[in-house]
Interface confidence: medium
Amino acid sequence: CKAMHVAQPAVVLASSRGIASFVCEYASPGKATEVRVTVLRQADSQVTEVCAATYMMGNELTFLDDSICTGTSSGNQVNLTIQGLRAMDTGLYICKVELMYPPPYYLGIGNGTQIYVIDPEPCPDSDF
């Protein structure tokens, strides 16, 4: 397993609708054709997998139908969007990139993007 540099923004603020987007960029040392991208969430020293997708270079990322993630790829960049976030989902979201094929296998893990989610204030009842 060989190491690979992965860059991602330090901080992102989710929208009022609970959507956060960030770019995950990897320094590809070879001509990878099959790439796997995994988003991990670290909170309270626990790491959980948020979503994962494998894509062939030049193709779209395909997450599972019930995934909260969507994404697009362009060269060595992956544009990730996480939906349905609430305040309790605030945490460090780490981008993990694996160059699956052809060998040699490369693994890169970013430093993480701190995503802040603020639940919108409920609309006050209004009398008409």
């Epitope: 397993c1 001509k31 054709t33 099959e34 796997r36 494998t54 062939m56 270079m57 030049g58 193709n59 699956m100 094929y101 052809p102 060998p103 040699p104 296998y105």
Partner: antibody
Amino acid sequence: QVQLQQPGSELVRPGASVKLSCKASGYTFTNYWVHWVKQRPGQGLEWIGNIFPGSDTSNYDEKFISKATLTVDTSSSAAYMQLNSLTSEDSAVYYCARLAYFTNYGGAMDYWGRGTSVTVSS
Amino acid sequence: DIVLTQSPASLVVSLGQRATISCRASKSVSTSAYNYMHWYQQKPGQPPKLLIYLASNLESGVPARFSGSGSGTDFTLNVHPVEEEDAATYYCQLSRELPYTFGGGTKLEIK
């Protein structure tokens, strides 16, 4: 269903070249690597190399670098292997095979053509 | 290049008994996550057929009497109980690195 179609046989003169074809159907050709494997009569399997139709990237075993050239034609979903300067040592069955997604299968070849038997004889 | 050594070269097994085929790599073909070893069956005049991938995963449509195990450098293919249609040559193949290599093959005969 996935199919890799190869001609049954080729008869070639020593010193000549031959271009073997592998016509793919039943899947997205540009998404999967195609491998080529040699099998001499009564012998085992030898990996020649592979090619990725999506980007024309290819790899070869060192001993086949000057013998084989791998190409693809994405418009017809076909992979080709040209063998040059043929000798009796090149008489063999040549298979093309599809590499299953590495993430799922780890480098196994899930579909194979029936092979082309190449006979080098004057 | 990694060399794969299969043993035995040939094997005669009675119907209903167990056939065990070994494949040894000259260096590890495993990582912390996967064992990059696969098994194929080839009958005369036919192309190889994938039986087991990643050391122990049964390919779709392959009978459950076929099983694979092992990690690192030592891998095993078991067939139990052996049936007449299992008479064939079996090959191991590695994919940890390029070039891919195959074992020399084991010819299984049923008596």
